[in-house]
């Protein structure tokens, strides 16, 4: 059962796994949620009645019964992990802690104008987990305005003490705010020969990479496949680091794969969700339960529903045994990974899907595209919405994209002459405009947030957010699209589609069925050549065919330019402007979303 509230002056007795230091009970709950075994915690706040060495301790706990006896204790705050909850969870922590010194390894010291600048520095430094900043009121003159970047093995402070006139905070890498590049490639036949900070067992290099991504100290990894010559090292995932942040030596070795942590773009990749099944593979670990199940899918469901289950192995039924049901072994370990992986025994193994909610919803795989034709099918573009105006009569106004459960991203130019959000309706999960009737449910718009530098589409900043009055419940036909990662600025998107109900030619009408077209991207230089009278800035992105023929058009405005990269769809552009529609050598111009990620996050995460 999901319990979100914190229990004041309460301590859970027993069940201790480990103790960490956190600046607040709220953050202790997040740390517990992300820990592979923690189900409950007790945090000690600062209090005159408590020994100062125990202030800010966060004791992570586990229990077979999922609860522990409660004891009254002043300054203790207890609670449950969010593992038991179905809502989306984020590790993002933007809080700044005043008069707290979070201790760790101080590996970088520099002058900063403000705590915000210090936090940005930490966010853009590959090693940094948290920082402490001495304000200009700090007593010691030579330490004023000093920004200390820190890291630890666990990613949490080794101790927290009270210290006047300093502030501390965490890196915002998990808030999608890092400018660090994401190196998504997995390099075959490569071993990175750097120091190992940890090792776990993994069924493939992708799982190894995800484990590296959420491990606080891992910057890159090497995985030995099941064909690796040394038997004792097969399926071994080595989590690595180096002073420079990059591998110092790459050794060419067959049957090994290496890659990098994707910490700075973790909002747009699945990190915790290992959804694949591994055939003829047994995962070993501590046994939690053995239950009968009809299939490996059913076994995965059982594991997902058992809060302590981390992974499973299913052994299919022998012919006519046990009503055709096989055995489902629910398992766990200290680190969430199998203690050993065996092949050739006929088992089918996999992981709990309970942790999928710790990943961004936008990373969920959607149904395969239909290639050929221009009409979309239901569920093909589940982030696409149709924005209607009701004044003077109801009609489709613009497209838009779901980027959060209360947020639509669209173009600013859509709101020319729109006096109030009250006349707007957002319809999601729509394929045909004809589906929209009087009684069709819609989302009202609470607020229109237009970029304050927007003047006209051709000048740029053609971006707007709609805050919905109610939240969107994600389903197969309505779910968010990922924002591009700032760390992916060095990537060429090659699978980009424009969608909308707009005109199919310049003098036309709104289409009934959602249309789609794959559009190649062109360089900004080429785009500038085609629009000599305008300034094509780096905040714009252009796409189109040299011979024309396919393009966004009137009514598509505000809709997405969706690009698939590494199996995840990203909102790379917002349909903005162009000369005519689908004209030869006149590419469409789109708002370059990656350049507005900070703006989007600032507006959508504002308290």
């Amino acid at each position: 059962e999901c319990v979100t509230q914190l229990l004041k002056d309460t301590c859970f007795e027993g069940g201790d796994i480990t103790t960490v230091f956190t600046p607040s009970a709220k953050y202790c709950q997040v740390v517990c949620t992300y820990h592979p075994r923690c189900l409950l915690f007790t945090f000690t706040a600062e209090s005159p009645s408590e020994d100062p060495t125990r202030w800010f301790t966060c004791v992570l706990k586990d229990s077979v019964t999922e609860t522990l006896p409660r004891v009254n204790r002043t300054a203790a705050i207890s609670g449950y992990s969010f593992k038991q909850c179905s809502h989306q969870i984020s590790a993002c922590n933007k809080d700044i802690y005043v008069d707290l010194d979070m201790k760790g390894i101080n590996y970088n010291s520099s002058v900063a104008k403000s705590a915000q600048e210090c936090q940005e520095r930490c966010t853009d430094d590959v090693h940094c987990h948290f920082f402490t900043y001495a304000t200009r009121q700090f007593p010691s003159l030579e330490h004023r305005n000093i920004c200390l970047l820190k890291h630890t093995q666990t990613g949490t402070p080794t101790r927290i003490t009270k210290l006047d006139k300093v502030v501390s905070g965490f890196s915002l890498k998990s808030c999608a705010l890092s400018n660090l590049a994401c190196i998504r490639d997995i390099f075959p036949n490569t071993v990175f020969a750097d120091s190992n900070i940890d090792s776990v067992m993994a069924p493939d290099a992708f799982v190894c990479g995800r484990i590296c991504t959420h491990h606080p100290g891992c910057l890159f990894f090497t995985f030995f496949s099941q064909e690796w010559p040394k038997e004792s090292q097969r399926n071994l995932c080595l989590l690595k680091t180096s002073e420079s942040g990059l591998p110092s030596t790459r050794i060419k070795k067959s049957k090994a794969l290496s890659g990098f942590s994707l910490q700075s773009c973790r909002h747009s990749i699945p990190v915790f969700c290992h959804s694949s099944f591994y055939h003829d593979t047994d995962f070993l670990g501590e046994e939690l339960d053995i239950v009968a199940a009809k299939s490996h899918e059913a076994c995965q469901k059982l594991c997902t529903n058992a809060v302590r289950c981390q992974f499973f192995t299913y052994t299919p039924a022998q012919a006519s045994c046990n009503e055709g049901k096989g055995k489902c072994y629910l398992k766990l370990s200290s680190n969430g990974s199998p203690t050993k992986i065996l092949h050739g025994r006929g088992g089918i193994s996999g992981y709990t899907l309970r942790l999928c909610k710790m990943d961004n919803e936008c990373t969920t795989k959607i149904k395969p595209r239909i290639v050929g034709g221009t009409a979309s099918v239901r569920g093909e573009w589940p982030w696409q919405v149709t924005l209607h105006t009701t004044s003077p009569t109801q009609r489709h106004l613009c497209g838009g994209s779901i980027i959060g459960n209360q947020w639509i991203l669209t173009a600013a130019h859509c709101f020319y002459g729109v006096e109030s959000p009250k006349i707007l309706r957002v319809y999601s999960g729509i394929l045909n405009q004809s589906e929209i009737k009087e009684d069709t449910s819609f989302f009202g718009v609470q607020e229109i947030i237009i970029h304050d530098q927007y003047k006209m589409a051709e000048s740029g900043y053609d971006i707007a957010l709609l805050k919905l009055e109610t939240t969107v419940n994600y389903t197969d036909s309505q779910r968010p699209i990922c924002l591009p990662s700032k760390g992916d600025r060095n990537v060429i998107y090659t699978d980009c589609w424009v969608t909308g109900w707009g005109y199919r030619k310049l003098r036309d009408k709104i289409q009934n069925t959602l249309q789609k077209a794959k559009i190649p991207l062109v360089t900004n230089e080429e785009c500038q050549k085609r629009y000599r009278g305008h300034k094509i800035t780096h905040k714009m992105i252009c796409a189109g065919y040299r011979e024309g023929g396919k393009d966004a058009c009137k009514g598509d405005s505000g809709g997405p330019l969706s690009c698939k990269h590494n199996e995840v769809w990203h909102l790379v552009g917002i349909t903005s402007w162009g000369e005519g529609c689908a004209q030869r050598e006149r590419p469409g111009v789109y708002t370059n979303v990656v350049e507005y990620v900070d703006w989007i996050l600032e507006k959508t995460q504002a308290v």
């Epitope: 290639v371 050929g372 060429i492 090659t494 794959k518 190649p520 360089t523 230089e525 189109g544």
Partner: antibody, heavy 119, light 107 residues
Framework: EVKLQESGPELVKTGASVKISCKAS????????MNWVKQSHGKSLEWIGF????????SYNQKFKGKATFTVDASSSSAYMQFNSLTSEDSAVYYC????????????WGQGSTLTVSS | DIVMTQSTSYLSVSLGGRVTITCKAS??????LAWYQQKPGDAPSLLIS???RLETGVPSRFSGSGSGKDYTLSITSLQTEDVATYYC?????????FGSGTKLEIK
Amino acid sequence: EVKLQESGPELVKTGASVKISCKASGYSFTGYFMNWVKQSHGKSLEWIGFINCYNGATSYNQKFKGKATFTVDASSSSAYMQFNSLTSEDSAVYYCARTISTGDSFDYWGQGSTLTVSS
Amino acid sequence: DIVMTQSTSYLSVSLGGRVTITCKASDHINNWLAWYQQKPGDAPSLLISGASRLETGVPSRFSGSGSGKDYTLSITSLQTEDVATYYCQQYWTTPFTFGSGTKLEIK
């Protein structure tokens, strides 16, 4: 007249690295993408990847990730491909070829640069 | 990856004859297909893009057709200068892939 001029033949030892250049002339270099294509002796063509000459963004064929690295120098209208940890299998003719978008044919090609890897 | 299959490796045709070279994609490529000609010792050169659009300067005896997965390059009235290897290439999805080539000779 559009021209892509590649660097001359290279004879290198196994395990070494090599950098092949492709100098563009006769068009606006930063308006295009530069592709790199491998042709082993008597074999077909293999796409290695491409680079956006405007901003240096890249896309690699998975097969060549970690092997090839693309760079551009807009000031000299040149594209480069570095090939590392060379083996005899890397012996081939390497072509640069331009394309106007991420989804278009390769309308102009360099003359090819021959790489021979010997032990 | 999309596999491009040119099932005929060699073709021997008389001068003035008509040639048809086929190319089959393992998946739909929506006409994002090009044909290249490569003469011995030379780099490939573009003949056709978009499955059927003839590039500037390419003789009109060359033509391209097809859709979905199946594409054809046709040469009417074969000339001696057409002796070369012909490659198809898809640019619908990365990695872009080429066919194995069809070598054309004069009978």
